[in-house]
């Protein structure tokens, strides 16, 4: 399906609004430090050029690839070398090396200030004064902070952002209407970004085989009534969409995602009974709805898997004839019967089954050898079940904040070399699994918890890859995608770690502590807790609890004092001395 002009083709397919939005996202994800106005200028230039190509596909340069056009445009930025350093070297390369060079320089933790939310009236004025600029600024600010955000989904978030302002800026109580909506968009956006980051990491580090296996398992759980051929078709199309988005081909990605939504809605009968309500919605909402759709009901009459995959004499013959297809069918059949399993567990079972066949199909009596293969699955299933049970019990006992603290201590002891901000961020997010998953019925707990943990641990892996400090983290992150969570769970106290020297400055606090939000206070305390464990990795739970309780009391006391700063100056050193004594 070749076109004389790729840029004209995409402009016509997507329409001007989506075209401009996606180009802005692409540029913002590549050049994360460039000012908004610079990006808007580049986007306008690209858009004007695209329009000339729509008018005449044979016009000069219209036959160039999108990577060539976009890369040439990015490489015109005057301050590239000063702002981005070695990323400027990408511009000396030819396509396709240049694009992949830009991709490799995407920064998962850009040095950008946290977004500050202005007063509601200020935001509403800005929205009314120039709605288009206001929404572009949203796309830009999110995209530059989340360089792997799923671009077509970001357009959906921007549409919801616009709708929130349109509704709430006319409400009697603007803040009461708007703020909860913005909080929800922020939280959903962070979750969406993290989920997409795992997809891109999977494709980049482990390849499309790993992604396809994940997609077969997940789609088979969602669409258990669909035939294997139907699931395979959806997996192939979905892999193409995510490969394109993760490769920076955002226009193609959005176009193909729209085609996939169209296909699914035209073929609902052979996919799932749950798609109806999604298919009546407009494009962005429809695609989002389809991606989030609940699992369909399992067919009532599914036979036992053992007949085809254990008892049959043809297992080795079928496996040898087409290994990938046979394992894909096994994964499909197992996943559609087990919506109660995490995708990662299903992939581990498929891996175990493959390993057994590799061994047994070369044995003297293959059937005898693989006859008990399903029994070998039991410990693999019980491990995450027990983990979820224990951690949910702990969460219910402690509540979210203290559960996070328990995880902070646990993970700091496992990998104390990791930076404190990363340990705090990751452990806080690991701790959110409790509120997210533990309230769910038993059958939904494991898929919720383990697949969420995979997303959070991927964040640890991408941050660690940027600044590697721990061989244990590198090993867990790179050896096996499906075994990352068990690998981290299995880590014990790092005996080789040399405790960090005590630094009083780390435990010195000031009156500004009192004006922080509850969340910011928690982060301060949790930062101190990590530093404490790095200083005394063998401290007991009781010792750490005592110090943290004293810390909370000390902060509360000083924040109630008339002269807060004087209190912190006087009580701080006492707290430090008492803590050192308690941990000696």
């Amino acid at each position: 399906d070749t076109h004389k002009s790729e840029v004209a083709h995409r402009f016509k397919d997507l329409g001007e609004e989506h075209f401009k939005g996606l180009v802005l996202v692409a540029f913002s994800q590549y050049l994360q430090q460039c000012p908004f106005e610079e990006h808007v200028k580049l986007v306008n230039e690209v858009t004007e050029f695209a329009k000339t190509c729509v008018a005449d596909e044979s016009a000069e340069n219209c036959d160039k690839s999108l990577h060539t056009l976009f890369g040439d445009k990015l490489c015109t930025v005057a301050t590239l070398r000063e702002t981005y350093g070695e990323m400027a070297d990408c511009c000396a390369k030819q396509e396709p090396e240049r694009n992949e060079c830009f991709l490799q320089h995407k920064d998962d933790n850009p040095n950008l200030p946290p977004l500050v939310r202005p007063e509601v009236d200020v935001m509403c004025t800005a929205f009314h004064d120039n709605e288009a600029t206001f929404l572009k600024k949203y796309l830009y600010e999110v995209a530059r902070r989340h360089p792997y955000f799923y671009a077509p989904e970001l357009l959906f978030f921007a549409a919801r952002y616009k709708a929130a302002f349109a509704e709430c800026c006319q409400a009697a109580d603007k803040a009461a209407c708007l703020l909860p909506k913005l909080d929800e968009l922020r939280d959903e956006g962070k979750a969406s970004s993290a989920k997409q980051r795992l997809k891109c990491a999977s494709l980049q580090k482990f390849g499309d085989r790993a992604f396809k296996a994940w997609a077969v398992a997940r789609l088979s759980q969602k669409f258990p009534k669909a035939e294997f051929a139907e699931v395979s078709k959806l997996v192939t199309d979905l892999t193409k969409v995510h490969t394109e988005c993760c490769h920076g081909d955002l226009l193609e990605c959005a176009d193909d995602r729209a085609d996939l939504a169209k296909y699914m809605c035209e073929n609902q009968d052979s996919i799932s009974s749950k798609l109806k309500e999604c298919c009546d919605k407009p494009l962005l909402e429809k695609s989002h709805c389809l991606a989030e759709v609940e699992n369909d009901e399992m067919p009532a009459d599914l036979p036992s898997l053992a007949a085809d995959y254990v008892e049959s004499k043809d297992v080795c013959k079928n496996y040898a004839e087409a290994k990938d297809v046979f394992l894909g069918m096994f994964l499909y059949e197992y996943a559609r019967r087990h919506p109660d399993y995490s995708v990662m567990l299903l992939l581990r079972l498929a891996k175990a089954y493959e390993a057994t066949l590799e061994k047994c199909c070369a044995a003297a009596d293959p059937h005898e050898c693989y006859a008990k293969v399903f029994d070998e699955f039991q410990p693999l299933v019980e491990e995450p079940q027990n983990l979820v049970k224990q951690n949910c019990e702990l969460f219910e006992q402690l509540g979210e904040y203290k559960f996070q603290n328990a995880l902070l201590v646990r993970y700091t002891k496992k990998v104390p070399q990791v930076s404190t901000p990363t340990l705090v961020e990751v452990s806080r997010n690991l701790g959110k699994v409790g509120a997210k998953c533990c309230k769910l019925p038993e059958a939904k707990r494991m898929p919720c918890a383990e697949d969420y943990l995979s997303v959070v641990l991927n964040r640890l892996c991408v941050l660690h890859e940027k600044t590697p400090v721990s061989e244990k983290v590198t090993k867990c992150c790179t050896e096996s995608l499906v075994n990352r969570r068990p690998c981290f769970s299995a880590l014990e106290l790092d005996e080789a770690y040399v405790p960090k020297a005590f630094n009083a400055e780390t435990f010195t606090f000031h009156a500004d502590m009192c004006t922080l939000s509850e969340k910011e206070k928690q982060v301060k305390k949790q930062t101190a807790l990590v530093e404490l464990v790095k200083h005394k990795p063998k401290a007991t739970k009781e010792q750490l609890k005592g110090v943290m309780d004293n810390f909370a009391a000390f902060v509360e006391k000083c924040c109630k004092a008339d002269d807060k700063e004087a209190c912190f100056a006087e009580e701080g050193p006492k707290f430090v001395a008492a803590s050192q004594a308690a941990l000696a």
């Epitope: 991709l103 494709l203 980049q204 499309d208 490769h247």
Partner: nanobody, 124 residues
Framework: QVQLVESGGGLVQAGGSLRLSCAAS????????MAWFRQAPGKEREFVAH???????TYLDSVKGRFTISRDNAKNTVYLQMNGLRLEDTAVYYC??????????????????WGQGTQVTVSS
């Protein structure tokens, strides 16, 4: 362990042609993505061409229209037909296989297996 063996290199005049071959030792080759890279003296290794396991291809801009990558899964072999050779094409050419099929095709760390290389020299 997959082994890749390149052949077909040699000395050729500018404007001439060569066909490089890369034979793989395993049947799993048919499900791997394959690529050719090259390294000229004193320069870093450079991507040349890539062929997806299903057959789609990607080329370095400067070789587009001159080089063609292809594969014969029955023979476990990937080829690089090089026409219109230029002096700047002089380099050691390496064959690489990516059994996982990663998406960054121009990046050498995406490949699990490498051949030993075959020298291509273009003279005036």
């Amino acid at each position: 362990q997959v082994q890749l063996v390149e052949s077909g290199g040699g000395l050729v005049q500018a404007g001439g042609s060569l066909r490089l071959s890369c034979a793989a030792s395993e049947r799993a080759f048919s499900h791997s993505n394959m690529a050719w890279f090259r390294q000229a003296p004193g320069k870093e290794r450079e991507f040349v061409a890539h062929i997806h396991w299903r057959g789609s291809t990607t080329y370095l801009d400067s070789v587009k229209g001159r080089f063609t990558i292809s594969r014969d899964n029955a023979k476990n072999t990937v080829y690089l037909q090089m026409n219109g050779l230029r002096l700047e094409d002089t380099a050691v050419y390496y064959c690489a296989a990516d059994s996982a099929r990663r998406i960054l095709v121009t990046v050498s760390t995406s490949y699990d297996y490498w051949g030993q290389g075959t020298q291509v020299t273009v003279s005036s």
